[in-house]
Interface confidence: low
Amino acid sequence: SEGRKTWRRRGQQPPPPPRTEAAPAAGQPVESFPLDFTAVEGNMDSFMAQVKSLAQSLYPCSAQQLNEDLRLHLLLNTSVTCNDGSPAGYYLKESRGSRRWLLFLEGGWYCFNRENCDSRYDTMRRLMSSRDWPRTRTGTGILSSQPEENPYWWNANMVFIPYCSSDVWSGASSKSEKNEYAFMGALIIQEVVRELLGRGLSGAKVLLLAGSSAGGTGVLLNVDRVAEQLEKLGYPAIQVRGLADSGWFLDNKQYRHTDCVDTITCAPTEAIRRGIRYWNGVVPERCRRQFQEGEEWNCFFGYKVYPTLRCPVFVVQWLFDEAQLTVDNVHLTGQPVQEGLRLYIQNLGRELRHTLKDVPASFAPACLSHEIIIRSHWTDVQVKGTSLPRALHCWDRSLHDSHKASKTPLKGCPVHLVDSCPWPHCNPSCPTVRDQFTGQEMNVAQFLMHMGFDMQTVAQPQGLEPSELLGMLSNGS
């Protein structure tokens, strides 16, 4: 079953622009720098038109195929497998002029016992087996090779690693007579890196390990191990960085406690506690040492593992993440929200914001959503006037000198971008919400009222009249 969104581009879009890489000199890869938008932010459309025109004029010089697809490669080492014993793999689109490599870890929840893994295998087999994987995938969002869609790293070598281990990329156990399923998420990443070294990764300058949802948590769990692996294999010059999207969860108190019945309603601490034993899960060594034996589950939570990481990591997290709300048993139905639930939701945003206080590179819009970086419209959301690709570009610049993101941001190039307004969609650039029945787009004020947030209650703590607040929201302040 095709269980996950692919955010594919619509057929009507113009074809992707050709590439602008110059041919590298005698076996020497030429670094291509990210686009610096500082001088052009006022007129981005005109700038993009120029880039596109330049790209098209240079296309005849390029030997690259004009093809957006990433191609499937099953691992040659077939002992590194998906849950069902089929070989794991990756999708690759090379960009020979670039020394940047983006490795993206797919998400898709997890399973933590024989029963819900059996069910997952019956209903979401693509997330447990490579047998039905398509030969190619389209790169979207940060995996796109189109500068309009991916102004950040469109020129990079793109690698999409499908999630087929159901273990939040943490497992290290193979299938056996005793184990019905293999859980090899951590080993899959290691093996993909090993194989990519023979496909050009050995010449990389930067390896960005990115991921969304369970893949975002996978980044936090594996980024230091990848850096260590490359050092041990003799590639200490490759800078390893992490980009964790929608994988920074809180082990907070659920709004309504439920027994650990299934993947979605089970409290995350309990699910991970059970899972880590079932998967033979491994966590970063420095984090593991901070907790007693049996308490390794703590390292799956961003705010606990992050301080122990050596590699620089950029954290992207919606303040009102739908997966977080789901595991907290909060379901927004369009019915009026009781005060207790309203306070719970606002407190969740506040807690999330607090955990990002000491994360210098972060992007956290006050939106109700889940995942962003491989959405085609990932460039649209802004925090304090800065888009995510722009923030990532600033992060790159800040890392030229220091290994861990600097506390003193570059002038006009912020990397710590966390919304401070206190309710879902108080940021006007949040992804569009539609009324489920009419299909009409809703503005922020309509959305808040639709959700049952009384404007008087929302305005009061801000010291505003409801009319003033509505005016501010419609003006995008």
């Epitope: 079953s1 095709e2 269980g3 996950r4 969104k5 998400g107 898709g108 929840w109 399973c111 029963e115 819900n116 059996d118 069910s119 997952r120 019956d122 209903t123 979401m124 949802s213 439920t258 027994d259 019945v261 299934d262 993947t263 979605i264 739908e322 997966a323 789901t326 379901h331 927004l332 139905t333 369009g334 889940h370 995942e371 489920q436």
Partner: antibody, heavy 119, light 110 residues
Framework: QVQLVESGGGLVKPGGSLRLSCAAS????????MHWIRQAPGKGLEWVSY????????YYADSVKGRFTISRDNAKNSLYLQMNSLRAEDTAVYYC????????????WGQGTTVTVSS | DIVMTQSPDSLAVSLGERATINCRAS??????????IHWYQQKPGQPPKLLIY???DLESGVPDRFSGSGSGTDFTLTISSLQAEDVAVYYC?????????FGQGTKLEI
């Protein structure tokens, strides 16, 4: 093969009680959450109640909360629905159904037992 | 509670023609890429029978003329070429959260 057989339905006066049973066979009963779903004559389907595989978590539709009690005996492969303070609007065919994991869909249904509440 | 609304309430289609039934949820029933929507067929005097689960997966043993699609709040059950034995009432059902709810049903006739 997987089989669910309901029993215990019948005619009862308003305010009366009934206990429905569902006998399961052909699968490991203790591994599955179970549901009761009902269908009033000529009407659509209405979810009534749920019991988790171990019986530790139960849920009820608002329309039956406080009057109906779901329970299970995994040793006997049986699911029960104790119905008290019955009303005319509880008249329906009552089905027990097995819940799939994670997806939550009902992949196996019994034939149903009829409950009629009438004076 | 999530309200499931099916359309139309009844549908008459010629043998061999395509039948389409829609189901709309009052809020999204998709999360992390999975759509918790399922379709059942019920014939007179029988219990419902699962046709499609998780929006688009065909239950084993169900003819492949049945298919499901959609995500978020809008879903469709399609019968590509209607057969006489497809006359029944069809229900959509969500399992995104408790309480589970069903659509009111769509009666399909020839």
């Amino acid at each position: 093969q997987v089989q669910l057989v309901e029993s215990g339905g019948g005619l009862v006066k308003p305010g009366g009680s009934l206990r429905l049973s569902c006998a399961a066979s052909g699968f490991t009963f203790s591994d599955f959450g179970m549901h009761w779903i009902r269908q009033a004559p000529g009407k659509g389907l209405e979810w009534v109640s749920y019991s988790s595989s171990g019986g530790t978590t139960v849920y009820y539709a608002d329309s039956v909360k406080g009057r109906f009690t779901i329970s299970r005996d995994n040793a006997k492969n049986s699911l029960y629905l104790q119905m008290n303070s019955l009303r005319a609007e509880d008249t329906a065919v009552y089905y027990c159904a097995r819940a799939s994991y994670d997806g939550g869909y009902f992949d196996c249904w019994g034939q149903g037992t009829t409950v009629t509440v009438s004076s | 509670d999530i309200v499931m609304t099916q359309s139309p309430d009844s549908l008459a289609v010629s043998l061999g023609e395509r039948a389409t039934i829609n189901c709309r949820a009052s809020k999204s029933v998709s999360t992390s890429g999975y759509s918790y929507i399922h379709w059942y067929q019920q014939k007179p005097g029988q219990p419902p029978k699962l046709l499609i689960y998780l929006a688009s997966d065909l239950e084993s043993g169900v003819p492949d003329r049945f298919s499901g699609s959609g995500s978020g709040t809008d879903f469709t059950l399609t019968i590509s070429s209607l057969q006489a034995e497809d006359v029944a009432v069809y229900y959509c059902h969500h399992s995104r959260e408790l309480p589970f709810t069903f659509g009111q049903g769509t009666k399909l006739e020839i």
